[in-house]
């Protein structure tokens, strides 16, 4: 789960997730509350929803390890694993490319953003 996600985000965005995204804004990293601060933060909020859905389906999102291929800038999720593994890969692929699409609006000030400042309605899934 987490190891897959970190590797995938680094490959797609070119950034070290632990330095750039975990945490970032109000939703990137563990947990999440309030209104997302920018497009990058929205990526993470959507990813949280993706994980929440898999949890309701009985998937072990942090334990399940999946296989995927990264080539020529694209991610191919393997169809070899279980249903949960395949869906987890799809969630992670989506957030990785979402973060890449929004690199141009990445704000360093939102890195280590103080979570008590995360106010407003938390978006529903």
């Amino acid at each position: 789960g987490i190891l897959n996600l970190n590797k995938m985000v680094k490959q797609v965005t070119g950034k070290m997730p632990i330095l750039s995204y975990w945490p970032y804004g109000c939703h990137c990293g563990l947990g999440g509350r309030g209104q997302p601060k920018d497009a990058t933060d929205w990526c993470c909020q959507t990813h949280d929803c993706c994980y929440d859905h898999l949890k309701t389906q009985g998937c072990s999102i942090y334990k399940d390890y999946y296989r995927y291929n990264f080539s020529q800038g694209n991610i191919h999720c393997s169809d070899k694993g279980s249903w949960c593994e395949q869906q987890l890969c799809a969630c992670d692929k989506e957030v990785a490319f979402c973060l890449k699409r929004n690199l141009d609006t990445y704000q360093k000030r939102l890195r280590f953003y103080w979570r008590p400042h995360c106010r407003g309605q938390t978006p529903g899934c």
């Epitope: 309701t56 389906q57 009985g58 399940d64 279980s82 249903w83």
Partner: antibody, heavy 120, light 106 residues
């Protein structure tokens, strides 16, 4: 027509290594998406999945038996192999190989099975 | 791992009778697969992705369910349906089978 056929020693002694062969025709294990699995069934009991091997030589094992299992393949000869080390009487069963249905996770074609008896 | 519990373990039905075999999963799964095994034969694929009949399976068979509860139904029992039926999941690793339901002709 897709067919699979298992072969094995029939009878072996406790603590020995069981070697099984699955010979198949009608498909190639070099085709992307293909996989062959081993499944066993003790007499009068249910089915237990043992291992998969994929077209790209990736392998998966049942965690409860992983330390004793080795799955391998010879793509050019259309064969898949399974080795089980340190067998005992609880490994007495009919052993099946089966092909994964393309793009799904069920077994669309099964072999006829080979009966293995482990004597103490 | 996900444990699949089939019920009943053994049942008998008369020709023409409706039959329902249940498979309960220890945690939620998205798809269930079913196999039929006649005595002395290897299992045959019977139902895939919960409700799709495998090639050659008579239309009197159907599959349904969601979450932790799945079933295989025969609308009208025939002599050739006497067999053992197994459910299977690969929602999460490892792939597991139910213990089977033996269906006998009354």
């Amino acid at each position: 027509q897709v067919t699979l056929k298992e072969s094995g020693p029939g009878i072996l002694q406790s603590s020995q290594t069981l070697s099984l062969t699955c010979s198949f025709s009608g498909f190639s294990l070099s085709t992307s998406g293909m996989a062959v699995s081993w499944i066993r069934q003790p007499s009068g009991k249910g089915l237990e999945w043992l291992a998969h091997i994929y077209w790209d030589d990736d392998k998966r094992y049942n965690p409860s038996l992983k330390s004793r299992l080795t799955i391998s393949k010879d793509t050019s000869r259309n064969q898949v192999f399974l080795k089980i080390t340190s067998v005992d009487t609880t490994d007495t069963a009919t052993y099946y190989c089966a092909r994964r249905g393309p793009g799904t996770w069920y077994f669309d074609v099964w072999g006829t099975g080979t009966t293995v008896t482990v004597s103490s | 791992q996900i444990v699949l519990t089939q019920s009943p373990a053994i049942m008998s039905a008369s020709p023409g009778e409706k039959v329902t075999i249940s498979c309960s999963a220890s945690s939620s799964v998205v798809y269930m697969y079913w196999y039929q095994q006649q005595p002395g034969s290897s299992p045959k694929p019977w139902i895939y992705r919960t409700s799709n009949l495998a090639s050659g399976v008579p239309a009197r068979f159907s599959g349904s369910g969601s979450g932790t509860s799945y079933s295989l139904t025969i609308s009208s029992m025939e002599a050739e349906d006497a067999a053992t039926y197994y459910c299977q999941q690969y929602h999460s690793s490892p792939l597991t089978f139910g213990a089977g339901t033996k269906l006998e002709l009354k």
